[in-house]
Interface confidence: medium
C-alpha cells in the first residue's frame, strides 16, 4: 500500500553476499538404490551466496567454493529395527559472492 | 558414500531459530493491478525461523512475529519515461520459534 | 529441574513380578526416546530395553526379552517398566535414562538409579 | 551377538595422559558414547557420537573412532576422573556397552 509512510524505515537492499542458510540432507545423497533408511541430522547449516545485485543483468554468484565433508548417521530400518551406520556427505560452503554479468542471451524485445 | 570417514566433522543439526534471509520484493506486493513499474530495492534482508527439529512429529514454526514497514522506490514507466514514487511493503519478521507439534496424523508403521 | 525420578524397585522373590516407574520433569518426555540399562552387583551397565518417543517402536536384550515389557505415558510424562518371571539374575540397579533423539543415539539423562533384589 | 571389548583397568598419574580404549568388530562403523560413573552414582555422559563433548564436560576429555577401535584420551588427568569408563554403540537394535574400565589415578 502506498498509506503509513512517516513510519516506515527505508528498505536496504539485501547485498550480494554469503549468509547462512540451512540445507536439507536428502537421502538421494547418500544412496540412490535404498530408500528404506532415515538421516541424521536432517538439515544442516551452510554458507550460500545471496541478495540482489545493483543492475538487472547481473546476478550474485559465488566466486570461492569450498567443499566440505561431514558424517551423519544412516539408520538402516531392517525388518523394522535399526541400524546405525555413518555416511559421509559432502556440503558446498561459498566463501565469497560476486554480482556477475548473466551469460544468457537476452530475449530480442 | 560411506568413505573418507576421517575427515568428516560430525554434521551439526541445524537448529530451529532465526536466521537472516533475502526476501524479494515483488511486484504484486505494491500493485496488483498493473506491471508497468519497476522496485527498488528489488530484495531486503528479513529475519525468518528455519532448521530442524529433534523429533518427527515437530516442526520449526515462529512463536513471535512481528511487521516491519519499510519505504521502497516505486519506478512507473511512462511513455518511456520513469516517474519516481515511494510505496510501503510491509514485510515479516520472525523473532522467536519454537519446535512445535505438528497436528498431522504420523502414518502407521 | 531436567531430572528423572525413579521408583518401584525392592525385594521380589523368583518368579515373582514388579514394576519400576521413571517420572520425567523439565523437559518434554513426549520427544524423547527412553531406556532401561541396569547393573548388577559389582557389574558393568547393561541396556535392557528401550522405547522410541512414541512409542511405536520397542527393544529388548536377548536376556530379559519375552519376560520384560517397556511402555510409556507421555500424558504423565512417565516411563514403565514391567518386570515379569524374574530370576536371581536380574539383581540389579536399574536406571532409567534419556535419548536426546526419537531414534536413540547416546544416553544424555540418567535416572538415580532404583535396586531390585530377586530373592527366595 | 555384537561385542565391545575395554581393559579392565588403566593407571595414569595426576597430570598425565589417560587412555582408554573399547574394540568391536568395524566399530567405525558405529558411533560410540563414553560414559563415566564414580562409585554409587548413575552414568555421566562424557563423550558421544565419537568425539563430541556435552556442555559441562571439561576440554581434557576426547574421543576417537576409526576401524576397530574406539579410544576415550583424558589428558592432564586429575583425581576427580578415577572412576569407571564405559563405552557404548547403538548398533543392531541393541544398545551395547563395553565391560567397562577402571580409571586409577596413582
Known amino acids: 500500500s502506498l498509506g503509513s509512510l512517516t513510519i516506515a524505515e527505508p528498505a536496504m537492499i539485501a547485498e550480494c553476499k554469503t549468509r547462512t542458510e540451512v540445507f536439507e540432507i536428502s537421502r538421494r545423497l547418500i544412496d540412490r538404490t535404498n530408500a528404506n533408511f532415515l538421516v541424521w541430522p536432517p538439515c544442516v547449516e551452510v554458507q550460500r551466496c545471496s541478495g540482489c545485485c545493483n543492475n538487472r543483468n547481473v546476478q550474485c554468484r559465488p566466486t570461492q567454493v569450498q567443499l566440505r565433508p561431514v558424517q551423519v548417521r544412516k539408520i538402516e530400518i531392517v525388518r523394522k529395527k535399526p541400524i546405525f551406520k555413518k555416511a559421509t556427505v559432502t556440503l558446498e560452503d561459498h566463501l565469497a559472492c560476486k554480482c556477475e554479468t548473466v551469460a544468457a542471451a537476452r530475449p530480442v524485445t | 558414500s560411506l568413505g573418507s570417514l576421517t575427515i568428516a566433522e560430525p554434521a551439526m543439526i541445524a537448529e530451529c531459530k532465526t536466521r537472516t534471509e533475502v526476501f524479494e520484493i515483488s511486484r504484486r506486493l505494491i500493485d496488483r493491478t498493473n506491471a508497468n513499474f519497476l522496485v527498488w530495492p528489488p530484495c531486503v534482508e528479513v529475519q525468518r525461523c528455519s532448521g530442524c527439529c529433534n523429533n518427527r512429529n515437530v516442526q520449526c514454526r515462529p512463536t513471535q512475529v512481528q511487521l516491519r514497514p519499510v519505504q521502497v522506490r516505486k519506478i512507473e514507466i511512462v511513455r518511456k519515461k520513469p516517474i519516481f514514487k515511494k510505496a510501503t511493503v510491509t514485510l515479516e519478521d520472525h523473532l522467536a520459534c519454537k519446535c512445535e507439534t505438528v497436528a498431522a496424523a504420523r502414518p502407521v508403521t | 529441574e531436567v531430572q528423572l525420578l525413579q521408583s518401584g524397585g525392592g525385594l521380589v522373590k523368583p518368579g515373582g513380578s514388579l514394576r519400576l516407574s521413571c517420572a520425567a520433569s523439565?523437559?518434554?518426555?513426549?520427544?524423547?526416546?527412553m531406556s532401561w540399562v541396569r547393573q548388577a552387583p559389582g557389574k558393568g551397565l547393561e541396556w535392557v530395553s528401550y522405547i522410541s518417543d512414541d512409542g511405536s517402536l520397542k527393544y529388548y536384550a536377548d536376556s530379559v526379552k519375552g519376560r520384560f515389557t517397556i511402555s510409556r505415558d507421555n500424558s504423565k510424562n512417565t516411563l514403565y517398566l514391567q518386570m515379569n518371571s524374574l530370576r536371581a539374575e536380574d539383581t540389579a540397579v536399574y536406571y532409567c535414562a534419556r535419548h536426546p533423539y526419537w531414534y536413540g543415539g547416546q544416553l544424555d539423562l540418567w535416572g538415580q538409579g532404583t535396586l531390585v533384589t530377586v530373592s527366595s | 551377538s555384537y561385542e565391545l571389548t575395554q581393559p579392565p583397568s588403566v593407571s595414569v598419574s595426576p597430570g598425565q595422559t589417560a587412555s582408554i580404549t573399547c574394540s568391536g568388530d568395524?566399530?567405525?562403523?558405529?558411533?560410540v558414547h563414553w560414559y563415566q560413573q564414580k562409585p554409587g552414582q548413575s552414568p555421566v555422559l562424557v563423550i558421544y557420537d565419537d568425539s563430541n563433548r556435552p556442555s559441562g564436560i571439561p576440554e581434557r576429555f576426547s574421543g576417537s573412532n576409526s576401524g576397530n577401535t574406539a579410544t576415550l584420551t583424558i589428558s592432564g588427568t586429575q583425581a576427580m576422573d578415577e572412576a569407571d569408563y564405559y563405552c557404548s554403540a547403538f548398533t543392531h537394535n541393541s544398545n551395547v556397552f563395553g565391560g567397562g574400565t577402571k580409571l586409577t589415578v596413582l
Open positions: 523439565g523437559f518434554t518426555f513426549s520427544s524423547y526416546a
Open positions: 568395524s566399530l567405525g562403523s558405529y558411533f
